[in-house]
Amino acid sequence: APTSSSTKKTQLQLEHLLLDLQMILNGINNYKNPKLTRMLTFKFYMPKKATELKHLQCLEEELKPLEEVLNLAQSKNFHLRPRDLISNINVIVLELKGSETTFMCEYADETATIVEFLNRWITFCQSIISTLT
């Protein structure tokens, strides 16, 4: 059973992940560049279901394309290079979802823009955090 300390750790990690995702979204929304149009054409895969920490597998698998799409920006809108930012997110995701069980992600039929994708995972973080508090 999860202890109060492990729950607190999970909550802090989720809050960190939430902030990172919000930072990326803000960076995109404040971004004025010819490459933005190109960035918005990329279609990301969305989870069929995202209600538990194990479903973060679906986010993990899309982190590489997310990094490559963010790389197009070559902007100062992000405090970190996309590579470092995504690396940080990856570490948090791996810790949150755990590596003991191998969960096969199921994707929804509809794909999403980078904005819709980020909003979906921001909502996921907020939802899980609310159940922990």
Epitope: K35, R38, T41, K43, K64, P65, E68, Y107
Partner: antibody, heavy 118, light 107 residues
Amino acid sequence: QVQLVQSGAEVKKPGASVKVSCKASGYTFTNYDINWVRQATGQGLEWMGWMNPNSGNTGYVQKFQGRVTMTRNTSISTAYMELSSLRSEDTAVYYCARSRQWLVLDYWGQGTLVTVSS
Amino acid sequence: DIQMTQSPSSLSASVGDRVTITCRASQDIRDDLGWYQQKPGKAPKRLIYVASSLQSGVPSRFSGSGSGTEFTLTISSLQPEDFATYYCLQHISYPWTFGQGTKVEIK
């Protein structure tokens, strides 16, 4: 980590067929197209076509149309490229590489040497 | 089909040199172009995608520029491990086509 592992070298006689496999790991196989590129010894790269592992849809370069077939087995995350009516000019290293929209050919297999000789 | 013409087909350079390779498309391909490096006996490796975005893990001495029909790959300061053959690839429309390659050799 993402890996594309291809089958071993093949020696075939003219007129025969060859089937090269490409096993994907480290990502969701159905999320990326598989492309096939070949390279004759000392020559440049030649794109042969693509296959969508999710739908099975394919697109082939006209010069290979009727001779090439790209298929997949999603249960084992493996793509195949079969080339028939082989001739000596088909002697080359055949590579598989994945792509997704405009993120193209980011990971490659190690290559499979196909030698066509009588 | 879109033709991709690379120049030069080969060049000799020394370590530390600035090297520029050009790729010209037979029609407008916007920025749907990638650059690949290949060493003997190895699979190609992507360096640049969408004309100017550096592949993660690729040294910053590599850069890409251009759009439309004229594209450039620049190596700002050639290193011993950069001696290889470089290819451009257009992927705006099928069939995708590669340039004929540029072999970078040691002077």
